[in-house]
């Protein structure tokens, strides 16, 4: 499966959106940075077989997706960023599941590294656990937004390095 | 691949108020912080401030706050420095800098540095 | 303002040799997790190189015998061995807290 080159460029605008929901300042959030212990390994492309990439990439964009779906993320970001945000992820799940589907037929490894898929689910609960216990403060959702950026950009990392696979 | 390209060496008068920019080229300019570093000959490194070319948003190092303005224009991929009421501590050379990794706030691609001379 | 000192402000080793920088902040610049302590490399008439992020990261594309270390407040950067072309300035840079600070630099000479 190809992955399409709009959907690089849904990540980038997804990037983008990230960037723009600042609400205030990450300079006043300095002291309440954290290590999320971003599970870099997962990042590179070059450990994994395509399919295991491709789904390393989905569960990522579903977390990403999921975390900003609550209720608590509605009420500290500005509506209609918000909105383009969650449609760009959408779109790029989309894209994901299509090359799923194709590249199981194509390889007859396992569909998911389960590791894999799950150092990214115990990354997200970290990022969980961290606004639960800032009680979803505006700073707490600062250090969450850059940390989602890091993590964005790590996927657009991987997502070159599969597209240079092909 | 990453560029910072900074304008040209400046020779202003005390008093006076000089603009340097700085042109982004290889990666996505709204979605890196652009810090500004001023160096004066022989010394080590200060840091100015930094701004977010995607919202204009600044920060500023209090020493600088009244010294230097910052702005972006995000259709020419450039930063803008803007320094102010010109002293001879003002001669120096400064550098717009790439944000690295978000909110570690260091610094990977510099660019060659803009030369201000302050001079009666 | 946080202020690093770095010692020694130059230093002379023999090729080969170890070179080892210290950086020590007034205040800790180290919470959950991260050290916000990083390190450049300068050459005469260049710009600044980064070489090491969050107090131990080799930055991609630097060499393995560069390498950073501490937390806290102390930190340290070494260069096993030190080539010919590691004759540079080197500064430590924080960003625990505003305003980000340098250090006065340490100038390493090549015997």
């Known amino acids: 499966c190809d992955l399409p080159q709009t959907h690089s460029l849904g990540n980038r605008r997804a990037l983008i959106l990230l960037g723009q929901m600042g609400r205030i300042s990450p300079f006043s959030c300095l002291k309440d940075r954290h290590d999320f212990r971003i599970p870099q390994e997962e990042f590179d492309g070059n450990q994994f077989q395509k399919a295991q990439a491709i789904s390393v990439l989905h569960e990522m964009i579903q977390q990403t997706f999921n975390l900003f779906s609550t209720e608590d993320s509605s009420a500290a970001w500005e509506q209609s960023l918000l909105e383009k945000f969650s449609t760009e992820l959408y779109q790029q799940l989309n894209d994901l599941e299509a090359c799923v589907i194709q590249e199981v037929g194509v390889e007859e490894t396992p569909l998911m590294n389960e590791d894999s898929i799950l150092a990214v689910r115990k990354y997200f609960q970290r990022i969980t656990l961290y606004l639960i216990e800032r009680k979803y403060s505006p700073c707490a959702w600062e250090v969450v937004r850059a940390e989602i950026m890091r993590s964005l950009s790590f996927s657009t990392n991987l997502q070159k390095r599969l597209r240079r696979k092909d | 691949q990453v560029q910072l390209q900074e304008s040209g060496t400046v020779l202003a008068r005390p008093g006076a108020s000089v603009k340097m920019s700085c042109k982004a080229s290889?990666?996505?300019?709204?979605?890196?912080?652009m810090h500004w570093v001023k160096q004066r000959p022989g010394q080590g490194l200060e840091w100015i401030g930094v701004?977010?070319?995607?919202?204009?948003?600044?920060t500023y190092n209090q020493k600088f706050k009244d010294k230097a303005k910052l702005t972006a224009v995000t259709s020419a991929n450039t930063a803008y420095m803007e320094l102010s009421s010109l002293t001879n501590e003002d001669s120096a050379v400064y550098f717009c800098?790439?944000?690295?990794?978000?909110?570690?706030?260091?610094?990977?691609?510099w660019g060659q540095g803009t030369t201000v001379t302050v001079s009666s | 303002d946080i202020v690093l000192t770095q010692s020694p402000a130059s230093l002379a080793v023999s090729l080969g040799q170890r070179a080892t920088i210290s950086c020590r902040a007034s205040?800790?610049?180290?919470?959950?997790?991260?050290?916000?302590m990083h390190w450049y490399q300068q050459k005469p008439g260049q710009t600044p190189k980064l070489l090491i992020y969050?107090?131990?990261n080799l930055e991609s594309g630097v060499p393995a015998r560069f390498s950073g270390s501490g937390s806290g407040t102390d930190f340290t950067l070494n260069i096993h061995p030190v080539e010919e072309e590691d004759a540079a300035t080197y500064y430590c840079?924080?960003?625990?807290?505003?305003?980000?600070?340098f250090g006065s630099g340490t100038k390493l000479e090549i015997k």
């Open positions: 800098t790439r944000n690295y990794k978000y909110d570690y706030y260091t610094m990977d691609y």
């Open positions: 290889g990666y996505s300019f709204t979605t890196y912080w």
């Open positions: 701004i977010y070319p995607g919202n204009g948003d600044t």
């Open positions: 205040k800790s610049v180290s919470t959950s997790g991260h050290s916000y």
């Open positions: 969050l107090a131990s």
């Open positions: 840079q924080h960003s625990g807290e505003l305003p980000f600070t």
